[in-house]
């Protein structure tokens, strides 16, 4: 086992004419990231064949905004190495693809936007444990400079990381049956390395990384005693009453699941249900990545597929939290103005506006009278978000389009009779009353509560209401 490491030194316009335009602009800032794909062997493999040796995604580089009028410089790069762990032997010959991606940082409503800027590929021979190899590759008008190496993870050594070595326990010689580890004469070939945590008392291995149990023991690390099946229950009565062996502790006793995992017994052993952020037989592995599907509710996962790569979730509208696990109560922020009703539809926010208001957030106060003509000489009066017409005499209705019956409201007091007239209404007053609406009684001595009637109008004559 080991790690292939790639260090990107620069990405920018190559030499010669036709310098590419900067991929970023003041209007559309962006940042770069890189993807590496490794395949074993030198054969010209189909482009779509998988990255059998592994793949990795870099972190995002710093945000870059082009200076107006300036040529595209070398673009700012992400920090750190791209690391591709390999589990088996290093093949010595390999093919690589390195992709340069641009992430646009403009309007984030629809999540990040990615586009492939450049892709370079090559085939190389490389021994593990050797020095950094430098390379320059061109893709169109772009140039990528990088270094790479393969290194073994202890205790593996050698040009293919297949030999297992460890420091000598004694200065003079290696243990029985173990040879010196050339060219590292101060180290010895190591015995087989069993799976980490495999019980030294109850487990053994014939292949590196495995853990096989001696009789009477079970579990992934041979730490769980096998309970006999003839007893009445897994925690059954003692041998004194049933004649059967007293079982050892149950597989979930003492909770073998780390990091808050919950244990459940299975017919052969136990199973851990791990909390988010952990996995493995005992929830012992943290390092959650995109391969675990950590982004809820359709969030976009950005990060590497290998266990050491961190991830970031870009949440769709309506969700937040590092894993997009929290539904945003966007209505609690009272985004709808002017008394509008807020509706959170999940994928979008809607405001149902009161009459007289409009806009996504009911922010526009409609000019109630705009474009609203009141007919027949009526005048428009704004108020409370609804338009109202004050109609001229003889007309009514919302827009003063209806001919009004002026007598409908019984305007003539004290039993006066109402007559509709082209210019309004006329009241014929009952004896003893006068005025436009027959509202004034006539005094018994013939005087009235009104000033003297105009010439030509006798008390009792119909009064026209002008």
């Amino acid at each position: 086992a080991g790690v292939f490491e790639l260090q990107i030194h620069s990405f920018g316009p190559g030499p010669g004419p036709g310098a590419p335009r900067s991929p970023c602009s003041a209007r559309l800032p962006c940042r770069l990231f890189f993807r590496v794909c490794l395949k074993p062997g030198l054969s010209e493999e189909a482009a779509e064949s998988p990255c059998a040796l592994g793949a990795a995604l870099s972190a995002r580089g710093p945000v870059y905004t082009e200076q107006p009028g300036a040529p595209a410089p070398d673009l700012p790069l992400p920090d750190g190495l791209l690391q591709v762990p390999f589990r088996d032997a290093w093949p010595g010959t390999f093919s690589f693809i390195i992709e340069t991606w641009r992430e646009e940082l403009g309007d984030q409503i629809g999540g990040p936007a990615w586009s492939l800027l450049a892709r370079v590929a090559g085939r190389r021979r490389l021994a593990a444990g050797g020095p950094w190899a430098r390379d320059i590759q061109r893709a169109g008008a772009w140039e990528l400079r990088f270094s790479y190496r393969a290194r073994c993870e202890p205790p593996a050594v050698g040009t293919a990381c297949t030999r297992l070595c460890r420091p000598r326990s004694a200065p003079s010689r290696c243990g029985p049956g173990l040879r010196p580890c050339a060219p590292l004469e101060d180290e010895c070939e190591a015995p087989l390395v069993c799976r980490a945590g495999c019980s030294p008392e109850h487990g053994f291995c014939e292949q590196p990384g495995e853990c096989r149990c001696l009789e009477g023991w079970t579990g992934p690390l041979c730490t769980v005693p096998v309970s006999t099946s003839s007893c009445l229950s897994p925690r059954g009565p003692s041998s004194a009453t049933t004649g059967c062996l007293v079982p050892g502790p149950g597989p979930c006793d003492g909770n073998p699941c780390a990091n808050g995992g919950s244990c459940s017994e299975t017919p052969r052993s136990f199973e851990c249900t791990c909390p988010r952020g952990f996995y493995g037989l005992r929830c012992e592995v943290s390092g959650v990545t995109c391969a675990d599907g950590p982004c809820f509710n359709g969030g976009l996962c950005v990060g590497g597929a290998d266990p050491d790569s961190a991830y970031i979730c870009h949440c769709p509208p309506g969700f937040q939290g590092s894993n997009c696990e929290k539904r945003v109560d966007r209505c609690s922020l009272q985004p709808c103005r002017n008394g509008g009703l807020c509706l959170d539809l999940g994928h979008a926010l809607r405001c149902r506006c009161r009459a007289g208001f409009a806009g996504p957030r009911c922010e526009h106060d409609l000019d109630d009278c705009a474009g609203r003509a009141c007919a027949n000489g009526g005048t428009c009066v704004e108020g409370g978000g609804a338009h109202r017409c004050s109609c001229a005499l003889g007309f009514g209705g919302r827009d003063c389009r209806e001919r009004a019956d002026p007598c409908a409201a019984r305007p003539c007091a004290h039993g006066g009779r109402c007559y509709a007239h082209f210019s309004g209404l006329v009241c014929a007053c009952a004896p003893g009353y006068m005025g436009a609406r027959c509202e004034f009684p006539v005094h018994p001595d013939g005087a009235s509560a009104l000033p003297a009637a105009p010439p030509g109008l006798r008390p009792g004559d119909p009064q026209r209401y002008l």
Epitope: E48, P50, A52, L57, E104, D107, Q108, I109, G110, G111, P112, A113, W114, S115, L116, Y279, V288, T289, C290, A291, D292, G293, P294, N297, G298, L300, C301, V302, G303, G304, A305, Y311, H314, P316, P317, G318, H347, A348
Partner: antibody, heavy 120, light 107 residues
Framework: QVQLQQSGAELARPGASMKLSCKAS????????ISWVKQITGQGLEWIGE????????YDNENFRGKATLTADKSSSTAYLEVRSLTSEDSAVYFC?????????????WGQGTTLTVSS | DIQMTQSPASLSVSVGETVTITCRAS??????LAWYQQKQGKSPQLLVY???NLADGVPSRFSGSGSGTQFSLKISGLQSEDFGSYYC?????????FGGGTKLEIR
């Protein structure tokens, strides 16, 4: 090379359940998701859900909640789709597809499809 | 749910012609869109991902464009093997939905 081999055509009775399988080969099973897609004959495609074999996490289409269950067995590199309480509306071709786990997302390899016929 | 509206639903063209299929999202999905081709009785195949990126092994006569809510797939110089159905699919928020499809037939 990458392959997704789906189980053969199935005939089922209404009310029954059916478990369809999708065996992956040619890549690391736990480094990708597996999505399931339904296609009624002569119609379009409908996404049912996705499972991440490494963690067992699933994300589903609410339209299939209670109807479809997604599981995966890492040891055999096989994903399963169980369709319950079958009706004639479940008669369709069901595809599994390999899904990228980090954005940009896409389904880059598809199984050949399993035809499920529900009939009494 | 985000609705994906594809147009036209079908079109009849001759070999050598250029066609453009469009896909409209009911809300902004930025570039989170893929295009697939499906031939009769076969499974779909990836053509374009992230709206504009050609999948490995796809001929350069195919090209994707667009961002936000409007997307298109262009096929320049149609070949006989290009006939079949085409689908767009978004990847922004759940559920991931497909367009209704465009059936491309030989005239």
């Amino acid at each position: 090379q990458v392959q997704l081999q789906q189980s053969g055509a199935e005939l089922a009775r209404p009310g029954a359940s059916m478990k369809l399988s999708c065996k992956a080969s040619g890549y690391t099973f736990t480094s990708y998701g597996i999505s399931w897609v339904k296609q009624i004959t002569g119609q379009g495609l409908e996404w049912i859900g996705e499972i991440f074999p490494r963690s067992g996490n699933t994300y589903d289409n609410e339209n299939f909640r209670g109807k479809a269950t997604l599981t995966a067995d890492k040891s055999s590199s096989t994903a399963y789709l169980e369709v319950r309480s079958l009706t004639s509306e479940d008669s369709a071709v069901y595809f599994c597809a390999r899904t990228t786990v980090f954005a940009p997302y896409y389904f880059d390899y598809w199984g050949q499809g399993t035809t499920l016929t529900v009939s009494s | 749910d985000i609705q994906m509206t594809q147009s036209p639903a079908s079109l009849s063209v001759s070999v050598g012609e250029t066609v453009t299929i469009t896909c409209r999202a009911s809300e902004n999905i930025n570039s989170n869109l893929a295009w697939y081709q499906q031939k009769q009785g076969k499974s779909p195949q990836l053509l374009v991902y992230a709206a504009t990126n050609l999948a490995d092994g796809v001929p350069s006569r195919f090209s994707g464009s667009g961002s936000g809510t409007q997307f298109s797939l262009k096929i320049s110089g149609l070949q006989s093997e290009d006939f079949g159905s085409y689908y767009c699919q978004h990847f922004w928020g759940l559920p991931w939905t497909f367009g209704g499809g465009t059936k491309l037939e030989i005239r």
